[in-house]
């Protein structure tokens, strides 16, 4: 899934490192590779044997504000007859990404980096069977 | 830009949009998530569209290690454990944000960078094109 685009102009890059106060980091949120394309196969979320739906989460105090999460449609997997086979499991595949969180404390504003775990899709796996003695 | 709700009692000088450059706290929230997919699950081996994980390492990026998935087969593994070419293993790709040291090699100055990673593979019914 692609990250929504935010309009930014690009500034001249300074030659030397900018001064940064101790305990903090300077972050430019003008995204490098903003315009690269996702070339995923067509409709794989519907064609998969472990199909999934997408939900968009929106938070105006997060950058990017829009994060797309996938949810597996079934517990089992779809067989050749188009029926759910519960002897197999649809499981989520997850990936970490970074976001910037904006925090309001009274009238002051601070920024925090945050790791977000995104579910990107689902895959069909053979279940792990635990045998009870 | 992104509109931010403002505290109504605060001075009106605050920009509604996210500024182009921000100073961020050195701590990262939610930092206890496991970054090594080999350690966090064995789905890459148990999947009907299994994949191998390749380590992509760059000391001038955060995180410095990103794992890239490559599907092992063109087809999918059937109930007998054989590759079924009537189905296709395809990568699931995701755009993620990482930090790039900018200006280059500056220790505590960064810019967001968007990179495309293959996170895993899924088994799909192929699109069949019929020739007239």
């Amino acid at each position: 899934r692609k990250i929504p685009k935010v309009g930014h102009t690009f500034f001249q890059k300074p030659e030397s490192c900018p001064p940064v106060p101790g305990g903090s980091m300077k972050l430019d949120i003008g995204i490098i590779n903003e315009n690269q394309r996702v070339s995923m196969s067509r409709n794989i979320e519907s064609r998969s044997t472990s199909p999934w739906n997408y939900t968009v989460t929106w938070d105006p105090n997060r950058y990017p504000s829009e994060v797309v999460q996938a949810q597996c449609r079934n517990l089992g997997c779809i067989n050749a007859q188009g029926k759910e086979d519960i002897s197999m499991n649809s499981v989520p595949i997850q990936q970490e990404t970074l976001v910037v969180r904006r925090k309001h404390q009274g009238c002051s504003v601070s920024f925090q980096l945050e790791k977000v775990l995104v579910t990107v899709g689902c895959t069909c796996v053979t279940p792990v069977i635990h045998h009870v003695q | 830009g992104i509109t931010i709700p403002r505290n109504p009692g605060c001075p009106n000088s605050e920009d509604k949009n996210f500024p182009r450059t921000v100073m961020v706290n050195l701590n990262i929230h939610n930092r206890n998530t496991n970054t090594n997919p080999k350690r966090s699950s064995d789905y890459y081996n148990r999947s009907t569209s299994p994949w191998n994980l390749h380590r992509n390492e760059d000391p001038e990026r955060y995180p410095s290690v990103i794992w890239e998935a490559k599907c092992r087969h063109l087809g999918c593994i059937n109930a007998d454990g054989n590759v079924d070419y009537h189905m296709n293993s395809v990568p699931i790709q995701q755009e993620i944000l990482v930090l790039r040291r900018e200006p280059p090699h500056c220790p505590n100055s960064f810019r967001l960078e968007k990179i495309l990673v293959s996170v895993g593979c899924t088994c799909v019914t192929p699109i069949v094109h019929h020739v007239a």
Partner: nanobody
Framework: EVQLVESGGGLVQAGGSLSLSCAAS????????MRWHRQAPGKQREFLAS???????NYADSVKGRFTISRDNAKNTVYLQMNSLKPEDTAVYYC???????????WGLGTQVTVSS
């Protein structure tokens, strides 16, 4: 907090070699990237080399081919082997480290390297 202690600095003649080492201690949860920078009097701190936990390295053009960065993950130690030293390599050499949990760079106090002509 991560503490870093550099050692191995000193006075050397032009064309000579020197090996610096830097040990990380404290709450060394997991050191990710280790790096060397230097600062000459009246100048900005300059990047020299960095090395990730898997051994991937990055060098500044000014030291490529002369300096070699290496590390011992078990000892949380990074090394800088400096060959064919020049008077312009005279500076305080700083070791830096980034934890796996975040990109912030922690610094050592530095070790003086003086190259005489």
């Amino acid at each position: 907090e991560v503490q870093l202690v550099e050692s191995g600095g000193g006075l050397v003649q032009a064309g000579g070699s020197l090996s610096l080492s830097c040990a990380a201690s404290g709450s060394v949860f997991r050191i990710d990237v280790m790096r060397w920078h230097r600062q000459a009097p009246g100048k900005q701190r300059e990047f020299l080399a960095s090395i990730a936990s898997g051994g991937t390295t990055n060098y500044a053009d000014s030291v490529k081919g002369r300096f070699t960065i290496s590390r011992d993950n078990a000892k949380n130690t990074v090394y800088l082997q400096m060959n064919s030293l020049k008077p312009e390599d005279t500076a305080v050499y700083y070791c830096g480290a980034n934890a796996e949990s975040g990109p912030y760079t922690y610094w050592g106090l530095g070790t003086q390297v003086t190259v005489s002509s």
